[in-house]
């Protein structure tokens, strides 16, 4: 008998090279093989459970950056007046959540913020839990 | 043939809003669906393997906080003279281990320490390994 | 019918108590049960996917330490002029990658660097993906 294989784990790595003041960061998924999807600049959550979240990047100017998952809820990450980020976190997310950025700069100009090495990784930690597609 | 499902991963999120000087933090599990259990203010480890551990909280006064898993062993986390914590770690735990807090404050009063956003998450990283219930 | 079991997850914990200037750290795996292997002072990657990486240690002198996975690629971790490390990261690694250290000290003497609590943990986060042995 063939031993059971793991169904693919829900995970995604998105990159971002540009963020817009008072808005968010433009995210793209470099791989077509990702098990999670990007839609309207947000990562769509289909499966309930804990997620390991890694966020990295170097910014062209000082900014405040938050990573949200649900309207009316506090952010997953919140960084104030930083020029770089290299953070890891764990959060419980659920079907219908959407992970997206909010960015504000402290300059009066409304220029785009350039990002070097901008990367956001989400990895589901509770396979076997509830999913809806 | 139906593809195999993952058995549930051992994981838990506990909250704590109060710690007692020279003792620990009073932990409660907000969900009845957790795959791990709390007993005598400790999280019970049933499965051997690596665990992802996330610890967060804001404290009402400066304290030293350690997270232990076994008598006679060093702590998983140890924070000295802090008013907040936001840490992630990886540790190897085994059946019969118990994860619990120890807290000491530097004030002469023996008042309880209030905690805002106190959260401890454990997620097993080696499903398929030894478990005993 | 017996519920399916998880095949073992690719993971390893290696220890290091000594590093050599201009070279790397001498790594040993304390357990024979590891699902990943050490060869020529490197951890061999057999499975594609995200890896959770934990790196800890206290060093006997100030050093710069990098953790590499592929020739011609940037490091997984890079720490400059540190006496200790306690870092967690997530990285995408693939079959044929090898995880190894590079260390340089800033002293003129070529002393061995003693390490206390030197530990590197890798845990595969995408079981079910491509592996080659």
């Amino acid at each position: 008998q063939v031993p059971p294989q793991y169904p693919p784990i829900q995970s995604i790595r998105v990159q971002f090279t540009r963020c817009e003041n008072e808005k968010g960061c433009i995210i793209t998924s470099p791989s077509k093989d990702e098990t999670m999807k990007v839609q309207d600049n947000s990562i769509i959550i289909n499966c309930d459970g804990f997620y390991l979240i890694s966020l990295k990047g170097y910014f062209s100017e000082e900014l405040s950056l938050s990573l949200y998952y649900r309207k009316g809820r506090g952010p997953l990450f919140s960084l104030s007046k930083v020029t770089s980020v290299d953070s890891i976190g764990v959060a419980y997310l659920a079907f219908k959540d959407k992970v997206y950025f909010n960015v504000t700069t402290h300059s009066t100009s409304y220029k785009d913020i350039q990002v070097n090495g901008g990367e956001l990784i989400l990895i589901h930690q509770n396979p076997g839990g509830f999913c809806a597609y | 043939q139906v593809p195999p499902q993952y058995p549930p991963i051992q994981s838990i999120r506990v909250q704590f809003t109060r710690c007692e000087n020279e003792k620990g933090c009073i932990i409660t599990s907000p969900s009845k669906d957790e795959t791990m259990k709390v007993q005598d203010n400790s999280i019970i480890i049933n499965c051997d393997g690596f665990y992802l551990i996330s610890l967060k909280g804001y404290f009402s006064e400066e304290l030293s906080l350690s997270l232990y898993y076994r008598k006679g062993r060093g702590p998983l986390f140890s924070l000295s003279k802090v008013t907040s914590v936001d840490s992630i770690g990886v540790a190897y735990l085994a059946f019969k281990d118990k994860v619990y807090f120890n807290v000491t404050t530097h004030s002469t009063s023996y008042k309880d320490i209030q905690v805002n956003g106190g959260e401890l998450i454990l997620i097993h990283q080696n499903p398929g390994g030894f478990c005993a219930y | 019918q017996v519920p399916p079991q998880y095949p073992p997850i690719q993971s390893i914990r290696v220890q290091f108590t000594r590093c050599e200037n201009e070279k790397g750290c001498i790594i040993t795996s304390p357990s024979k049960d590891e699902t990943m292997k050490v060869q020529d002072n490197s951890i061999i990657i057999n499975c594609d996917g995200f890896y959770l990486i934990s790196l800890k240690g206290y060093f006997s002198e100030e050093l710069s330490l990098s953790l590499y996975y592929r020739k011609g690629r940037g490091p997984l971790f890079s720490l400059s002029k540190v006496t200790s490390v306690d870092s967690i990261g997530v990285a995408y690694l693939a079959f044929k990658d090898k995880v190894y250290f590079n260390v340089t000290t800033h002293s003129t003497s070529y002393k061995d660097i003693q390490v206390n609590g030197g530990e590197l943990i890798l845990i595969h986060q995408n079981p079910g993906g491509f592996c080659a042995y």
């Epitope: - | 350690s66 702590p75 986390f77 | 006997s60 006496t83 206390n116 609590g117 030197g118």
Partner: antibody, heavy 120, light 107 residues
Framework: EVQLVESGGDLVKPGGSLRLSCVAS????????MSWVRQAPGKGLQWVAY????????TYTDAVKGRFTISRDNAKNTLFLQMNSLRADDTAVYYC?????????????WGQGTLVTVSS | SYELTQPPSVNVTLGETAHITCGGD??????VQWIQQNPGQAPVVIIY???NRPTGIPERFSGANSGNTATLTISGALAEDEADYYC??????????FGEGTQLTVL
């Protein structure tokens, strides 16, 4: 002025237990790795146990592994050595010592010692 | 495990120079400390990191370390220097290894 003051030494029967303490002052205790070193009567110095500044990593000499436990309370500037299953050859003066900064395993500041006698 | 070899005793004439050696495999690749202990007293570090003197230690004490031998030199030995001297290194992480000790006698 750096001071390390040990206490808890006593006469104890074989198989018994003792807990040694070492209170530190005159330096920032929580930033220093610490050791216990012992000296049997008429003999040389022998390293016993080591603990990193945050208490997370500990190391022991083979002769005491599984019997002794080193720990620390950074809030109280105190180092401990819990000694169980004591044997006659554990009889010694026990010194607590703080590492020289950046030289791991190099006891630098020493206490005056506390005498542990294991005898029936 | 790592071993350090010291002579059990060294004699020196008052005012002359004493050399105490400490042998170990490639000891030059490790930092050496020298510790002085007077009878019934706590140990005191007199040399750290091969050749550095802590504050308050007289200049007559000096250290060197290369190859397989580290040396403690006492230039112009005084009667008060009569004591036991231990060399020490850190090995395999943080295992502090001590030599057997050398008894210095000032004649």
């Amino acid at each position: 002025e750096v001071q390390l003051v040990e206490s808890g030494g006593d006469l104890v029967k074989p198989g018994g237990s003792l807990r040694l303490s070492c209170v530190a002052s005159g330096f920032t205790f929580r930033t220093y790795h610490m050791s216990w070193v012992r000296q049997a009567p008429g003999k040389g110095l022998q390293w016993v146990a080591y603990i990193t500044r945050d208490g997370i990593s500990t190391t022991y000499t083979d002769a005491v592994k599984g019997r002794f436990t080193i720990s620390r309370d950074n809030a109280k500037n105190t180092l401990f050595l819990q000694m169980n299953s004591l044997r006659a050859d554990d009889t010694a003066v026990y010194y607590c010592a703080s590492d020289l900064v950046l030289v791991l395993g190099a006891p630098f500041y020493w206490g005056q010692g506390t005498l542990v006698t294991v005898s029936s | 495990s790592y071993e350090l070899t010291q002579p059990p005793s060294v004699n020196v004439t008052l005012g002359e120079t004493a050399h105490i050696t400490c042998g170990g495999d490639s000891i030059g690749r490790k930092y050496v400390q020298w510790i002085q202990q007077n009878p019934g007293q706590a140990p005191v570090v007199i040399i750290y990191k091969d050749s550095n003197r802590p504050t308050g230690i007289p200049e007559r004490f000096s250290g060197a370390n290369s190859g397989n031998t580290a040396t403690l030199t006492i230039s112009g030995a005084l009667a008060e220097d009569e004591a036991d001297y231990y060399c020490q290194v850190g090995d395999s992480g943080t295992k502090a290894v001590f030599g057997e000790g050398t008894q210095l006698t000032v004649l």
